[in-house]
Interface confidence: medium
Amino acid sequence: KETAFVEVVLFESSPSGDYTTYTTGLTGRFSRAGATLSAEGEIVQMHPLGLCNNNDEEDLYEYGWVGVVKLEQPELDPKPCLTVLGKAKRAVQRGATAVIFDVSENPEAIDQLNQGSEDPLKRPVVYVKGADAIKLMNIVNKQKVARARIQHRPPRQPTEYFDM
């Protein structure tokens, strides 16, 4: 289970139409459910239940998008429509270049994601928890435009892509 280095960049637009960026670094783990490779894209927050419906009509995320899913406590969803792995697959089917799960409330999901799958996804499936998950969800919950860049080695220049 390799470390996933995640850079999250928040884009704030000013009244003049210019954009300012704020970069945050955090770490997670690549799960065995997906590939250990780099990915980047705009963050799209996905509710676990939102992955249940089969509606594939997504807005055009032309440059690729990264799905972020905050998993709930298992007691709140005793009969989930899909397993955690199924949710990851559904997000990738819809075009996600990667999926990041916040497993803080559902640590059992880590084992589910790391069960050796015969057919792992060709995109990264990363999980975060603790302080890193809090950092990530704080950004996602701002409802502003943000991009994530996932790497399997530490970024040499942390703000290379995004420092404007």
């Epitope: 884009f11 954009y19 995004f162």
Partner: antibody
Framework: EVQLVQSGAEVKKPGASVKVSCKAS????????MHWVRQAPGQRLEWMGW????????KYSQTFQGRVTITRDTSASTAYMELSSLRSEDTAVYYC??????????????WGQGTLVTVSS | EIVLTQSPGTLSLSPGERATLSCRAS???????LAWYQQKPGQAPRLLIY???SRATGIPDRFSGSGSGTDFTLTISRLEPEDFAVYYC?????????FGQGTKVEIK
């Protein structure tokens, strides 16, 4: 100051290829996508494709698929557009334009000055 | 692909007058991803409006955009001498990105 500076005018024979460059300065090259758009004399603008300057991913218009190749050199902050199997209808001004790569953000907010490519036997 | 049709083809007006340019899409433009550009002879296009109604950096407030779905409008409240040019609409909500054929605003 943001600037996109393109290479000079080219005259090519039918069947040949042309490679136009677009050098970016004044911003972080890898934070943006670079698009290529062309305009034939007296015609509307026509989108050709883009490259994500950060990771090199590309997307091309079906109209040019197989004939156009967009690349970039991050160390030189330069994007390139190569068009092959040129025909007279490819005579046009070719522009590069940058895009912030976020939904809701401004598309094509800065453009190169344009490169005239003339295809003539 | 989404086809954009602009009208009128040419608009003959005097400085100080109001200009209203129309852009109609063959199908709904996703999330109002519609932009307007100004182009003068021998120059590259310049972004005026994006997201149907947001002014780009440095664009004077006499330029405004409105509309959603398939019908969009660019309004220039009081034409200045430097506003006489060709205006293009562009949709960037679905691939391929497409442009209208342009509206020329000329001095009457």
């Amino acid at each position: 100051e943001v600037q996109l500076v393109q290479s000079g005018a080219e005259v090519k024979k039918p069947g040949a290829s042309v490679k136009v460059s677009c050098k970016a300065s004044g911003y972080t090259f890898t934070s943006y996508a670079m698009h290529w758009v062309r305009q034939a004399p007296g015609q509307r603008l026509e989108w050709m494709g883009w490259i994500n300057a950060g990771n090199g991913n590309t997307k091309y218009s079906q109209t040019f698929q197989g004939r156009v190749t967009i690349t970039r050199d991050t160390s030189a902050s330069t994007a390139y557009m190569e068009l092959s199997s040129l025909r007279s209808e490819d005579t046009a001004v070719y522009y590069c334009a940058r895009d912030l790569m976020v939904r809701g953000g401004p598309p094509f907010d800065y453009w190169g000055q344009g490169t005239l490519v003339t295809v003539s036997s | 692909e989404i086809v954009l049709t602009q009208s009128p083809g040419t608009l003959s007006l005097s400085p100080g007058e109001r200009a209203t340019l129309s852009c109609r899409a063959s199908q709904s433009v996703s999330s109002s991803y519609l932009a307007w550009y100004q182009q003068k002879p021998g120059q590259a296009p310049r972004l005026l409006i994006y997201g149907a109604s947001s002014r780009a950096t440095g664009i004077p407030d006499r330029f405004s955009g409105s509309g959603s779905g398939t019908d969009f409008t660019l309004t220039i409240s009081r034409l200045e001498p430097e506003d006489f040019a060709v205006y293009y609409c562009q949709q960037y909500g679905s691939s391929p990105r497409t442009f209208g054929q342009g509206t020329k605003v000329e001095i009457k």
